[in-house]
């Protein structure tokens, strides 16, 4: 964390060693990339690569940068004004209902269904019924047959585990 610039008019126990860039709050708020000092007089810069703030704020601590998990790639690094942007590796996706982990995309659609959407970092492959065109829920039955490129070969169960 960053520290306060000393000011002559501060009480001694509210001072700290001069280290980081300082500006004054505007109407009690500090700009993105800063947090407010505990005496409300200074805006203290966040530490690049360690923490950040995205909006005008009265935060006492900048927000901690996210670290990309294994199975994720870093699209853009954490700056003082923007959090790290992480994305699931190729072949995996992050679901809205389980955003904490990347899950493996299915390798193919169940029998009787056709693929209409590819695996992306934010969605599994999309399957629809050949006849009706209705979407498959994505929930895999206990034993699911997967359409493979070579007819007659035994179908392998899909794995959704990440």
């Amino acid at each position: 964390e960053s520290a306060l610039i000393t000011q002559q008019d501060l009480a001694p126990q509210q001072r700290a060693a001069p280290q980081q860039k300082r500006s004054s709050p505007s109407e009690g708020l500090c700009p993105p990339g800063h947090h407010i000092s505990e005496d409300g007089r200074d805006c203290i810069s966040c530490k690049y690569g360690q923490d950040y703030s995205t909006h005008w704020n009265d935060l006492l601590f900048c927000l901690r940068c996210t670290r990309c998990d294994s199975g994720e790639v870093e699209l853009s690094p954490c700056t003082t004004t923007r959090n790290t942007v992480c994305q699931c590796e190729e072949g995996t996706f992050r679901e809205e209902d389980s955003p904490e982990m990347c899950r493996k995309c299915r390798t193919g659609c169940p029998r009787g269904m056709v693929k209409v959407g590819d695996c992306t970092p934010w969605s599994d492959i999309e399957c629809v019924h050949k006849e009706s065109g209705t979407k498959h829920s994505g929930e895999v039955p206990a034993v699911e047959e997967t359409v493979t490129s070579s007819p007659g070969t035994p179908a392998s169960p899909c794995s959704l585990s990440g």
Epitope: I36, G40, D58, L60, F61
Partner: antibody, heavy 117, light 108 residues
Framework: EVQLLESGGGLVQPGGSLRLSCAAS????????MSWVRQAPGKGLEWVSA????????YYADSVKGRFTISRDNSKNTLYLQMNSLRAEDTAVYYC??????????WGQGTLVTVSS | EIVLTQSPGTLSLSPGERATLSCRAS???????LAWYQQKPGQAPRLLIY???SRATGIPDRFSGSGSGTDFTLTISRLEPEDFAVYYC?????????FGQGTKVEIK
């Protein structure tokens, strides 16, 4: 002279609620971040919660998150701690303190909260 | 969270002796956000040192603080009778704010 005076402590049953107050004087209250720190009988100090000068940002220890709410009324120079779903392990002397990060440079005398059936 | 470990747990010394109290952090702490407190039975804590080495208002110069990174020290150069108490270190570098478990300085 900076003064902090806590009130509102007492005996409460598990699951009950209590609201602590801290009346501040001797400094520009609305400018300063304020905190609550507690001390269980015979134990060390534990930071509980903090709030920015304007009241716009609040922080909590994991042990009280979702149960305690810190707030302030800058027109009354008063800091509050609303404590809900109290547990036996919340039994402690609760101190109001000025500051949060660099130091707690002034402390109140403390108010005892006892959670017991 | 940053865990602060104070040692020794108890220090038995005589008035006039030098006391050296240690505070070790589980990860690096900015010196600007390391403080020391004294607490006597039945009283609220009192700020002694802030910014790792700066004495708070009204604190005698026999109290001094030093250190950086993960190792910090509070030194009382010559113990006075009123210095026998419990001492706590505290960090505000990271959330949550944490205290050490305390070191008791008792009369030998």
């Amino acid at each position: 002279e900076v003064q902090l005076l806590e009130s509102g402590g007492g005996l409460v049953q598990p699951g009950g609620s209590l609201r602590l107050s801290c009346a501040a004087s001797g400094f520009t209250f609305s400018s300063y971040a304020m905190s609550w720190v507690r001390q269980a009988p015979g134990k060390g100090l534990e930071w509980v919660s903090a709030i920015s000068g304007s009241g716009g940002s609040t922080y909590y220890a994991d042990s009280v998150k979702g149960r305690f709410t810190i707030s302030r009324d800058n027109s009354k120079n008063t800091l509050y701690l609303q404590m809900n779903s109290l547990r036996a392990e919340d039994t402690a002397v609760y101190y109001c303190a000025k500051g949060v990060r660099i130091s707690f440079d002034y402390w109140g005398q403390g108010t005892l909260v006892t959670v017991s059936s | 969270e940053i865990v602060l470990t104070q040692s020794p747990g108890t220090l038995s010394l005589s008035p006039g002796e030098r006391a050296t109290l240690s505070c070790r952090a589980s990860q690096s702490v900015s010196s600007s956000y390391l403080a020391w407190y004294q607490q006597k039975p039945g009283q609220a804590p009192r700020l002694l040192i802030y910014g790792a080495s700066s004495r708070a208002t009204g604190i005698p110069d026999r109290f001094s603080g030093s250190g950086s990174g993960t190792d910090f020290t509070l030194t009382i150069s010559r113990l006075e009778p009123e210095d026998f108490a419990v001492y706590y270190c505290q960090q505000g570098s990271n959330q949550p704010v944490t205290f050490g478990q305390g070191t008791k300085v008792e009369i030998k």
